[in-house]
Every structure is written in C-alpha cells, then in structure tokens.
Interface confidence: low
C-alpha cells in the first residue's frame, strides 16, 4: 500500500539538528547516513501527521519517532503511538488533538532502532504548519441589480484564517482572485447578467494566529447566472 504524502515548500521556522556518529572504519558506516527529514502538518488542529520518506533508506527500516515540547509543561519525551505505514514500513506518525500544543516549540526526533546513535532532531513551530479544511457552505446573494455577495463557513475560528476567492465567467481564460481577511465575505460590485460565474475559496491560517504558508484545498465551486453560453467564443473554439 502506497501512501500519498503532502509535502511543504519549506518552513522557514524549521530548524534541524542532525546528530550523526561516524564510525572509525574505512567504509561508510550506516550511522553516518542522514535520516530523512520529517514533515509535519496540523490539519485543522484536529490531528497532526508527521511523515518522512521511508524509501530514502538504503534498506527497509522501521524508523521510530519520539516527540516533546521544549521548555514547557509538556517536555516529557513521548513515543509515537499511531504510526503511518508505506509498504509495511513506518513512514509517519499521527498525533491526536490532545497531543497538539500550537504555541510551544515542538521537537521531533527520528531514530534508527537498529543503530540508536543514528538520530535526527528537528524543532518546529506548529502554528506555522496548520492547514485548515476547505471552506464550506458557499452561498451567493444579490445586494443590488449588479452586485453579488459571496459568503462561506470554515470549521475553524474565523479570525484565525485569511481567504483567497477566485472567480471567472465562462468567457474567461483564467481566474480573477481576491484576498479576503477573516471576515469571510466577498462582494463583486459589477456582475454581467448574461454570463455564468463560478466562484471558489480557499483558506489559510494566517496572519492573526500563525504564519502558515499552506492553503486549504479549494472549496466546491458555486455558480451564478445564465446557463446559456451559446455566444461564448471559447466554447465555440473548444467544440470546433
């Protein structure tokens, strides 16, 4: 069974300290091999997945994960209690909500149990690794003859999220996008009643509660306006 792992573009707040031991032999010891980097994401502050590329190991190895919180009441070393697997080899650890403390420095340690000196420790700021669920319940209503308002909900504290709205008509090649703050509503002041509009939204844990760079998935799209696009030149081009 192969697992699909979401990987980040990088987290500037991540610091990694690799503790490696070189054995005094001519050949390269297994303990000098770097361990894979651990990537953690906190999904809607409901659970966290910390994953690594298990296939980077020279031979299949069930690496183990320990974690703790630096300089806090939660500084006791904890063992991973729920491993994720890829082709029967450990490739991650899932932590539940009660084990997540967003504003304490999270320390994660990966170790090769066959070679205990081969270990790597990383420190992560979890508030920068939150990915909310996609916005839900998109609704549109007319404010005036030519003005539309888009509203949506998030399963999250509203003030913690910023949003990106994209919209386009059936005539448009590309999306027009607009940033929206935590108030989670968007107005389009000038709507052409002859065109069909599509809207979608995604959200990010930024900037009031954290500095996450990763957006949620896009919401399901919502449509407004005419379904008849007979005079749409791009549709003609597609049908030709």
């Amino acid at each position: 069974l192969n697992t699909t792992i979401l990987t980040p573009n990088g987290n500037e707040d991540t610091t990694a300290d690799f503790f490696l031991t070189t054995m005094p032999t001519d050949s390269l010891s297994v303990s000098t091999l770097p361990l894979p980097e651990v990537q953690c994401f906190v999904f809607n502050v409901e659970y966290m997945n910390c994953t690594w590329n298990s296939s980077s190991e020279p031979q299949p190895t069930n690496l183990t994960l320990h974690y703790w919180y630096k300089n806090s009441d939660n500084d006791k070393v904890q063992k991973c209690s729920h491993y994720l697997f890829s082709e029967e080899i450990t490739s991650g650890c899932q932590l539940q909500k009660k084990e997540i403390h967003l504003y304490q420095t999270f320390v994660v340690q990966l170790q090769d149990p066959r070679e205990p000196r081969r270990q790597a420790t990383q420190m992560l700021k979890l508030q920068n690794l939150v990915i909310p669920w996609a916005p839900e319940n998109l609704t549109l209503h007319k404010l005036s003859e030519s003005q539309l308002e888009l509203n949506w909900n998030n399963r999250f504290l509203n003030h913690c999220l910023e949003h990106l709205v994209q919209y386009r008509t059936d005539w448009d090649h590309s999306w027009t996008e607009q940033s929206v703050d935590y108030r989670h509503k968007f107005s389009l002041p000038s709507v052409d009643g002859q065109k069909r509009y599509t809207f979608r939204v995604r959200s990010r844990f930024n900037p009031l509660c954290g500095s996450a760079q990763h957006w949620s998935e896009w919401s399901h799209p919502i449509h407004w306006g005419s379904n008849t696009s007979k005079e749409n030149p791009f549709l003609f081009a597609l049908e030709a």
Epitope: N44, V45, S72, K97, H101, Y103, Q104, R155, F156, L157
Partner: nanobody
Framework: QVQLVESGGGLVQAGGSLTLSCAAP????????VGWFRQAPGKEREFVAS????????YYDDSVKGRFTISRNNAWNTVNLQMNSLKVEDTAVYYC???????????WGQGTQVTVSS
C-alpha cells in the same frame, strides 16, 4: 457550560485607558483560546485580540496593535484586555469569547460597554 463574565467597561476620554476583564467564575476556561471581540453600533462584530491557553499565542487586530495588551492569569480563569491610548473609534460593546478545539468560539459573555468621548 462555561459562563463568561466581562467587567471593566465605562466612559473614558480619548487618550485614556481602561482594563477589561473576562472571568470564568469558579473554574478554568477549559478551552484552547480566549478572544476579545467588539461591536460598534450599526457595525459587525470584529476581532480585537486572542490568547492561547499556554499564553504564547497572542494576536491582535492591526487597529489595536501597540495600544491594547491581552494577558491571562496562571490559573487560566481570567483574561484581561489592557486598553491604552483609546480613540473615539474604539467605542463599542466588548465581548469575551472562549474557543474549544479551534473550531469555533463556543462560549460568549454578555458584553461590556466602552465609550470613548472626545
């Protein structure tokens, strides 16, 4: 059920200070985050500041940054909002809210009126 009680509101001149307090009488908040919001007449309720249970996660709306300070006591049953350099536009009803599990603010106080006169 967490009962939240705000206090400390009142009438103050522009440039003055007030300290609002939010309490969960007889118990801790039992939640991950506590926030302050405000609602001026005819306007929507807006976020002011929030603080996490650990006290490390503190955030402010840009309109109050540098003037307002949110803090908590160690027992996690009182959260204060120190408001300095008050402006007329800070006039509003101020609400305290407690959020359980980051999904929503489940518990709200009744609000305390802050009026800033020129």
């Amino acid at each position: 059920q967490v009962q939240l009680v705000e206090s400390g509101g009142g009438l103050v001149q522009a440039g003055g200070s007030l300290t609002l307090s939010c309490a969960a009488p007889g118990r801790t908040f039992g939640t991950d985050v506590v926030g302050w919001f405000r609602q001026a007449p005819g306007k929507e309720r807006e976020f002011v500041a929030s603080i996490s249970r650990s006290g490390d996660g503190i955030y402010y709306d840009d309109s109050v940054k540098g003037r307002f300070t949110i803090s908590r006591n160690n027992a996690w049953n009182t959260v204060n909002l120190q408001m300095n350099s008050l402006k007329v536009e800070d006039t509003a009803v101020y609400y305290c809210a407690a959020g359980d599990g980051w999904s929503t603010y489940d518990y709200w106080g009744q609000g305390t009126q802050v009026t800033v006169s020129s």
